[in-house]
């Protein structure tokens, strides 16, 4: 019942933080415009993985999405990959995890079976989770690094006559979304993996039972039959680092590094 | 048709108070950010105030912080500015202006104006 | 805040001539965002409240004749008017429609030779 509840909760979790990792992809406000300690502008301006967009302060909001792929940056780039593979990772680690689910009965599929669905599912959900809390930190680190580097040269201009002001970008409510569902997710894949366990058919040992026959002395021992399953996963670590691009707008060319973080 | 109507203006004394009204037709009302504009005689345009679809946020210039409130009441279609501690150099003519939808915060409809004159 | 300087205070033309009125920014009103421009230019002639003619620096509001014109980026802005007619003559304001105080040049008036 415990590895049932386990499991079932597991897939539950994985469920949500897949959803959630869905949502924060999609979502444009990966990162936002300071408004803390900068002139205050009738514009806010905001970024996602996909496009970027300018609210008015008379409501109205224009997205423009980045119509290039080789001109954009190689993090951010970096961040889409890692997204865009948890994902998948997680979509096909529920569906494995449907079939696994010890509450469904799918013709004959023995436990065995079962067990090395759920903790395939499991490792599916981890390396997801993983993925997603990746990409969002390596997307937050890009902005903390771009966040200090505008505000040491907060204005820039020609002898300091024509002033520009440098728009400075901070956290946006997708990172934390998918550092949340990034951590469900993970723990989905943990209680998978723990329901695995449970789920494995134990070794079952029968004492030696002995018949007295009148005449012969016969044992009879029957034999042990045990289950077992074993998956491992290697994973490396690879740092990505920013082959730093120009932008692309949808009919010119601007090159700032404020077009995308 | 839109339409903005200004009201409430007149002769104030030097410490005295005022509130201007602005009557709005002709749109959805509650759906747009709302601006007071003043020009003093034979002078250029000062813009006041804003006040966003929602009551919030709302702008001032600095010099009138404190002296001067906008509001609004979108049931009743009016804006309003409410100055306190008048002074001569308020003296101008008051115009409410609408912040259009898509035109880059700029201010697509004015009213005819209500005059402030601050003297004693 | 924003200072917005109009140039020239004042400018004698005479009908079918072609005026360019100039409005310089202390400041960039690029939004990095979008690539827009936030400046405005109104017109305003004698006793009545200004009129919106060029929003977004280049983008003329409906009902605008064609022989308006906005052009700039950053913090030099242009209107032209290809050929003066004589319901033209009026001052015309630009303003910066980025940063709050929204600030408004001190005026060009256009006046018949």
């Known amino acids: 019942m415990a590895v049932t509840a386990c499991q079932g909760l597991g897939f539950v979790v994985s469920l949500i933080g897949i959803a959630g990792i869905i949502a924060a992809t999609c979502m444009d406000q990966w990162s936002t415009q300071d408004l803390y300690n900068n002139p205050v502008t009738a514009v806010f301006n905001y970024q996602g993985l996909w496009r970027s967009c300018v609210r008015e302060s008379s409501g109205f909001t224009e997205c423009r999405g980045y119509f290039t792929l080789l001109g954009l940056p190689a993090m951010l780039q970096a961040v889409r990959a890692l997204m865009i593979v948890g994902i998948v990772l997680g979509a096909i680690g529920l569906l494995v995890s449907i079939f696994a689910l010890k509450c469904i009965r799918i013709g004959s599929m023995e436990d065995s079976a079962k067990a090395n669905m759920t903790l395939t599912s499991g490792i599916m959900f981890i390396v997801s989770g993983l993925c997603a809390i990746a990409g969002v930190s390596v997307f937050a680190n890009m902005l903390v690094t771009n966040f200090w580097m505008s505000t040491a040269n907060m204005y820039t201009g020609m002898g300091g006559m024509v002033q520009t002001v440098q728009t400075r970008y901070t956290f946006g409510a997708a990172l934390f979304v998918g550092w949340v569902a990034g951590g469900l997710t993970l723990i989905g894949g943990v209680m998978m993996c723990i329901a695995c366990r449970g789920l494995a058919p134990e070794e079952t040992n029968y004492k030696a039972v002995s018949y007295h026959a009148s005449g012969h002395s016969v044992a009879y021992k029957p034999g042990g039959f045990k289950a077992s399953t074993g998956f491992g996963s290697n994973t490396k670590n690879k740092k990505i680092y920013d082959g730093g691009a120009r932008t692309e707008d949808e009919v010119q060319s601007y090159p700032s590094k404020h077009d995308y973080v | 048709d839109v339409q903005l109507v200004e009201s409430g203006g007149g002769s104030v004394q030097p410490g005295g108070s005022r509130r201007l009204s602005c009557a709005a037709s002709?749109?959805?009302?509650?759906?747009?950010?709302m601006h007071w504009v003043r020009q003093a005689p034979e002078k250029g345009l000062e813009w006041v105030a804003y006040?966003?679809?929602?009551?919030?946020?709302?702008y001032y210039v600095d010099k009138l912080k404190g002296r001067f409130t906008v509001s609004r009441d979108n049931p009743k279609n009016t804006l309003f500015l409410q100055m306190t501690s008048l002074r001569s150099e308020d003296t101008a003519m008051y115009y409410c202006?609408?912040?259009?939808?898509?035109?880059?915060?700029?201010?697509?409809?004015w009213g005819q104006g209500t005059s402030i004159t601050v003297s004693s | 805040d924003i200072v917005m300087t109009q140039s020239p205070s004042s400018l004698s033309v005479s009908v079918g001539e072609k005026v360019t009125l100039s409005c310089k920014s202390s400041?960039?009103?690029?939004?990095?965002?979008?690539?827009?421009?936030?400046l405005a230019w109104y017109q305003q002639k004698t006793g009545q409240p200004p009129k919106l003619l060029i929003y977004?620096?280049?983008t003329r509001e409906s009902g605008v004749p064609d022989r308006f014109i906005g052009s700039g980026s950053g913090t030099d802005f242009t209107l032209t008017i290809s050929s003066v007619q004589a319901e033209d003559l009026a001052v015309y304001f630009c303003?910066?429609?980025?940063?709050?105080?929204?600030?408004f040049g001190a005026g060009t008036k256009l006046e018949l030779k």
């Open positions: 977004g620096a280049s």
């Open positions: 002709g749109f959805t009302f509650s759906s747009f950010g």
């Open positions: 303003q910066n429609d980025l940063f709050y105080p929204l600030t």
């Open positions: 202006a609408r912040a259009g939808y898509a035109v880059r915060n700029a201010l697509d409809y």
């Open positions: 006040i966003s679809s929602g009551s919030s946020p709302i």
């Open positions: 400041q960039s009103l690029l939004n990095l965002g979008n690539q827009k421009n936030y």
